[in-house]
C-alpha cells in the first residue's frame, strides 16, 4: 500500500498548500466539497508557506515525509512509499 | 485511512502551542533547520488565523478524513 494511497486526498491538499499552488488547492478542495470559509482558512496556511519561500515548502514536506514513513505509520503505510514522497517533496 | 501520527501532527499544527508542535516534530529526529522552519510556520499560522479560521480548517480536515478519497 502506497503512503499516498492511505489517504490520497490528504496528501493532495497538503502538497498543494505547501507548494503554494492555489489552482491545485482549489481543485483538491472541490473534491471534498469545501465551504468558502474552509477554503479561506487553507489559503491562510498556504500564505505562510509562500512567504517563507521554497525551502520552507521543502522542509515542511520533509516533516510530513518523515512522520509518514516513521514506525508510527508503518502499520498503515509500507516503506516503499518513502521514496515516492521524497521525490514529490524534493523534486520541486 | 490517515495515519494517526500524521493526524496528530496536523492537529498540533493548528491547535497546539509552538512549543508543543516543535516538540512533536522533534520526536521524529528532524534536522535542526527543519525544526526551526516548523516553528516559523507555526508562528505564522497562529498570527494569520483566527480561532474561527482554525475551526474551519479542522472541519475541512474532518471532511478529508471521512471522504471516500481517504
Amino acid at each position: 500500500v502506497k503512503m499516498a494511497e492511505t489517504c490520497p486526498i490528504f496528501y493532495d491538499v497538503f502538497f498543494a498548500v505547501a507548494n503554494g499552488n492555489e489552482l491545485l488547492l482549489d481543485l483538491s478542495l472541490t473534491k471534498v466539497n469545501a465551504t468558502e470559509p474552509e477554503r479561506t482558512a487553507m489559503k491562510k496556511i498556504q500564505d505562510c508557506y509562500v512567504e517563507n519561500g521554497l525551502i520552507s515548502r521543502v522542509l515542511d514536506g520533509l516533516v510530513m515525509t518523515t512522520i509518514s514513513s516513521s514506525k508510527d505509520c508503518m502499520g498503515e503505510a509500507v516503506q516503499n512509499t518513502v521514496e515516492d514522497l521524497k521525490l514529490n517533496t524534493l523534486g520541486r | 485511512e490517515i495515519c494517526p501520527a500524521v493526524k496528530r501532527d496536523v492537529d498540533l499544527f493548528l491547535t497546539g502551542t509552538p512549543d508543543e508542535y516543535v516538540e512533536q516534530v522533534a520526536q521524529y529526529k528532524a534536522l535542526p533547520v527543519v525544526l526551526e522552519n516548523a516553528r516559523i510556520l507555526k508562528n505564522c499560522v497562529d498570527a494569520k488565523m483566527t480561532e474561527e479560521d482554525k475551526e474551519n480548517a479542522l472541519s475541512l480536515l474532518d471532511k478529508i478524513y471521512t471522504s471516500p478519497l481517504c
Epitope: V58, L90 | E36
Partner: antibody, heavy 120, light 107 residues
Framework: QVQLQESGPGLVKPSETLSLTCTVS????????WSWIRQPPGKGLEWIGY???????NYNPSLKSRVTISVDTSKNQFSLKLRSVTAADTAVYYC??????????????WGQGTLVTVSS | DIQMTQSPSSLSASVGDRVTITCQAS??????LNWYQQKPGKAPKLLIY???NLETGVPSRFSGSGSGTDFTFTISSLQPEDVATFYC?????????FGQGTKLEIK
Amino acid sequence: QVQLQESGPGLVKPSETLSLTCTVSGGSISNYYWSWIRQPPGKGLEWIGYIYYSGRTNYNPSLKSRVTISVDTSKNQFSLKLRSVTAADTAVYYCARHRITRTADSFDYWGQGTLVTVSS
Amino acid sequence: DIQMTQSPSSLSASVGDRVTITCQASQDITNYLNWYQQKPGKAPKLLIYDASNLETGVPSRFSGSGSGTDFTFTISSLQPEDVATFYCHQYGDLPYTFGQGTKLEIK
C-alpha cells in the same frame, strides 16, 4: 557551477570589527541556507552561523554576542560582522552553502577562504 | 554542544593500505554526520554525507558507516593524492560541530 568568493580586509586591529562579504556566482542566493565557518591557523573548523535568504539567522552560542550575519539578495551576497575582535579571532574564514535533503544537511560549496589576522 | 572526538589525530600509511578513521559523538546524532577532506591551503570538500552516502564525483575507495554515536570513515586503498586532513561534522543539533581532524600522510 556555483562559486563563492570571500572578500574583506586581511588585517583587523584588536577591539575593532571584522567585516567580510561572500559573493555567490553561478547560482541564486535564494532558497538556500548559507554559513560562515572559520579555521584558526593549524587548527580545526568552527561553525560561526548561518543565514537564510529571507534574513533568518542562527549563530553559534560561543560567538552569538559578537556576530551579525546579513544578506543582500539583490547583490547575491551575504556578510559577516564580528565585533570586539582579539588575537583568538585570527583565522581563515570560509563561506559555504548548505545542501539540505530529507536526512542530510551538508556544506556542498565552499569559498576558497580568506585569512584575517587580528593584530595592532 | 555536541562534542566530536576524532581518532587518531594523525596517521601515516603506505599507498594501497586500508585506512580507517573514527569519530565519536558525545550524544546520539542518528546518522547526521558528514566527512570532509581538506588539502593544504584549500577549502574542505564534502566526501560523505548522511554517515554513509558517497558525494557525487567522489572516488568509491572512500566510504563511511555508523550511526548513533560511533562512526567510521574508510579509504579502501590509499592513493598519493589522498594526503589531507579529514574532518567529521555533525548536524544533528545546533551548533554544528566538527571533529578536531585527522592528518593523513604517506609513508
